[in-house]
């Protein structure tokens, strides 16, 4: 049909973090390059129907379905999704093509299905069909990488049995300590599975796919470094491969390295050596100890000895199941309003944990740092001095761990008041939780010094706002105080705050707030 317009259907994936729901739109967002969806004429269909290639979207991903129409004159359009009509606003691009877009933000199950776009041009009417489904990530896995020796070569292969196929990269660093942080200029990344340069200070292999990124560090004993105060410890699960690298540098080549397990030399086939001359004919030797699949009897002290360096050992512990060891008792802290403070959890875990910090139903990224004693630590400092309950949650393949923290911020009370026909109530959120006094203002007591003790009902911590306790005090109205001004005061060790209430009729009052330090 010569009258049929030239149309193009594209999918645009967005890197946005908006949280709105699907809407027909033409506004730009941060996006990746468009993907052509084909849009072929559907055969044997009544009317002119174009069908775009099926679209698979990750949960929470944001996309735009877009149609570009090369047809003369104006066009009008209508989107239909699950029998509901959705507004459609076509516009024209620089090439004078009609552009119709449907933006789906934060993809959910309810937004999956068939999207029909009806377009009416001066020449003809036609329909475009998009089928959007959620990608099944239940089958996805991301496994921690492990090492294997390359056959007949002095090289390591990094393997991660993950779905979809991960991108594997080696992360190498030749500096010590802090300068080996991921984004440091000292860090070199090599996107390949095989590594021949095995003499570096710090060697890690990382695998990444749609589920994230997992890394494994090549466990190293460096005989030129001062040994840690506590023996380094390596945990492995039964069946996993063991790799330990012993590294030593000497002024010349005249030295050798050996591995022993519990004072017994490792069997041939369980180690291999490499050496290289560094500058000034200094020699670096590395000796790998490896077991392709560990059993319980591979547990023990592995000692690397040199003819020119003091020996160093590592304790290898083979476990049946992963673990997370930490104290899970809840902890309460009280700090001043401007005091620097961080929550911290010290734990020992294998395999490495994934963790989050949560406050007020919002999750925060969790960083973990290895300590010299085999423990790791996670700190959270981003509390912005908001009191309440903070939760640390950690998990690995075999274990879960949750720890609760309560943060109280020391401050003087702030009082809010409300009144009804039968009672007046005051609320305060200061910490330590305040005590209350009610005073009556009268001719006899213009300064409101006459204390009210009858009909007062204090409730400490009657309302929890994200773990923040609120104290309240209620005064039941009696004939003796009706029509009078009363003052409720909340006080703690940091000060006092008062609110004055006229006890006559219900409704909002022009309360007068006094702040007395």
């Amino acid at each position: 049909n010569q009258d049929l317009p030239v149309i193009k259907c594209v999918l645009i994936n967005h890197k946005n973090n908006d949280s709105s729901v699907g809407k027909s739109s033409s506004y730009p967002m941060v996006s990746e390059s468009p993907e052509d969806l084909g849009c072929a004429l559907r055969p044997q269909s009544s009317g002119t129907v174009y069908e775009a290639a099926a679209v698979e979207v990750d949960v929470s991903a944001s996309i735009t379905l877009q149609v570009l129409v090369d047809a003369p004159g104006n066009i009008s359009c209508l989107w239909v999704f699950k029998h509901s009509s959705l507004n459609c606003q076509p516009h024209f691009d620089l090439q004078n093509r009609g552009v119709v877009s449907m933006v789906i933000l934060k993809m959910t199950e309810t937004q999956a299905g068939e999207y029909l776009l009806f377009i009416q041009s001066e020449a003809t009417n036609y329909t475009i069909l998009f089928t959007v489904s959620i990608r099944n990530t239940l089958l996805y896995t991301l496994r921690r990488p492990y090492f294997r020796k390359m056959e007949n070569q002095d090289a390591l292969v990094c393997i991660s049995e993950s779905v979809p196929e991960p991108i594997v990269e080696w992360v190498l660093c030749d500096s010590q300590g802090e300068s080996c942080k991921e984004e440091s200029p000292a860090v070199v990344k090599k996107e390949e599975k095989v590594l021949h340069e095995l003499f570096g200070t710090d060697i890690r292999c990382c695998a990444r796919n749609e589920l994230g990124r997992e890394c494994t560090r090549l466990f190293t004993i460096d005989l030129n470094q001062t040994p840690q105060t506590t023996l380094p410890q390596l945990f492995l699960k039964v069946g996993e491969p063991l790799w330990i690298r012993c590294k030593a540098v000497h002024v010349n080549h005249g030295f050798g390295l050996t591995w022993e397990l519990e004072n017994k030399a490792l069997e041939e086939g369980n180690y291999f050596e490499m050496s290289t001359y560094s500058t000034n004919r200094t020699m670096i030797r590395i000796l790998f100890a490896f077991v392709s699949s560990v059993a319980r009897n591979d547990t023990g002290y592995y000692t690397c000895s040199s003819s020119k360096h003091p020996s160093q050992s590592a304790l290898v512990t083979i476990v049946e199941k992963g673990f997370i060891n930490a104290t899970n008792s809840s902890e309460d802290y009280e700090i001043d309003q401007y005091e620097e403070f961080c929550f911290s959890v010290r734990f020992k875990a294998y395999p490495q944990i994934r963790c989050t910090w949560t406050f007020s139903r919002k999750s925060f990224p969790c960083e973990q740092k290895g300590l010299d004693n085999g423990y790791s630590i996670s700190k959270f400092c981003n509390h912005k001095h908001q009191p309440g309950e903070y939760i640390f949650h950690a998990e690995n393949d075999d274990a879960q761990f949750t720890k609760m923290f309560t943060l109280n911020i020391r401050r003087k009370p702030q009082v809010l008041a409300e009144a009804s026909a039968s009672q007046a109530s005051c609320f305060s959120d200061g910490y330590p939780l305040p005590s209350w006094t009610w005073k009556k203002c009268s001719d006899k007591s213009p300064n409101c010094t006459e204390e009210i003790t009858e009909g007062v009902w204090n409730r400490k911590a009657n309302r929890k706002v994200f773990g923040q306790w609120v104290s309240s005090s209620t005064l039941n109205m009696s004939e003796a105080i009706k029509g009078f001004l009363v003052k409720c005061c909340a006080y703690n060790s940091l000060g006092t705050s008062c609110e004055t209430i006229l006890l006559n009729s219900p409704g909002p009052f022009p309360f007068i707030q006094d702040n007395i330090s």
């Epitope: 005249g254 001359y277 000034n280």
Partner: antibody, heavy 117, light 110 residues
Framework: QVQLQESGPGLVKPSQTLSLTCTVS??????????WSWVRQSPGKGLEWIGE???????NYNPSLKSRVTISVDKPKNQLSLKLGSVTAADTAVYYC?????????WGQGTLVTVSS | QSVVTQPPSVSAAPGQKVTISCSGS????????VSWYQQLPGTAPKVLIY???VRPSGIPDRFSGSKSGTSATLGITGLQTGDEADYYC???????????FGGGTQLIVL
């Protein structure tokens, strides 16, 4: 069996740059555990160490030649090269490349370079 | 002028024993390994001894090496006419960060 073969012009004019290549066969120039050196021998004189290069790319040079010498490696071509600038008649010599480890275990057969106008 | 010195020449009759000395300082011979090379006329040098006293395979046990303090010695017993050649010691200088050859010794078999 590792073999080293020097190549380059036999005659270089004074003040020009002497360039030699050493092609390694039967083994990889990237093999760990070795460094690669250039040594020369003026007619009727003893052996003179010029310099050496390590797997890392680090180099050491004879202080008397340091300002004029560059040693480099082309790993894909499995070649070692020597450049010596601003040559004079005193640079006339047989130039050897050698593989170093515990000792120089493999040597090229040497190539005579004459500096003359 | 070499920092590591050798006698210009030594001579002995066939079947005799000869020693060639190599003298340096603490920064070279004193703290580093010494190797010895034989250079027959018109050929590239060939190693005889490395790591002060180790013979590579294929080198007859007539050749031996030793080191004491800042001096090294190459010993050849049962001299043969085929031993007539130039002999060089080689070491590393840790202060200068350079390799260095001795000036060379011509062995004459009388």
């Amino acid at each position: 069996q590792v073999q080293l073969q020097e190549s380059g012009p036999g005659l270089v004019k004074p003040s020009q740059t002497l360039s030699l290549t050493c092609t390694v066969s039967g083994g990889s120039i990237s093999s760990s555990g070795y460094y690669w050196s250039w040594v020369r021998q003026s007619p009727g004189k003893g052996l003179e160490w010029i310099g050496e290069i390590y797997q890392s790319g680090n180099t050491n040079y004879n202080p008397s030649l340091k300002s004029r010498v560059t040693i480099s490696v082309d790993k894909p071509k499995n070649q070692l090269s020597l450049k010596l600038g601003s040559v004079t008649a005193a640079d006339t010599a047989v130039y050897y490349c050698a593989r170093g480890g515990s000792y120089y275990d493999y040597w090229g057969q040497g190539t005579l370079v004459t500096v003359s106008s | 002028q070499s920092v590591v010195t050798q006698p210009p020449s030594v001579s002995a009759a066939p079947g005799q024993k000869v020693t060639i000395s190599c003298s340096g300082s603490n920064s070279n011979i004193g703290n580093n390994y010494v190797s010895w090379y034989q250079q027959l006329p018109g050929t590239a040098p060939k190693v005889l001894i490395y790591d002060n006293n180790v013979r590579p395979s294929g080198i007859p046990d007539r050749f031996s090496g030793s080191k004491s303090g800042t001096s090294a010695t190459l010993g050849i017993t049962g001299l043969q006419t085929g031993d007539e050649a130039d002999y060089y010691c080689e070491t590393w200088d840790s202060s200068l960060n350079v390799g260095m050859f001795g000036g060379g010794t011509q062995l004459i078999v009388l």
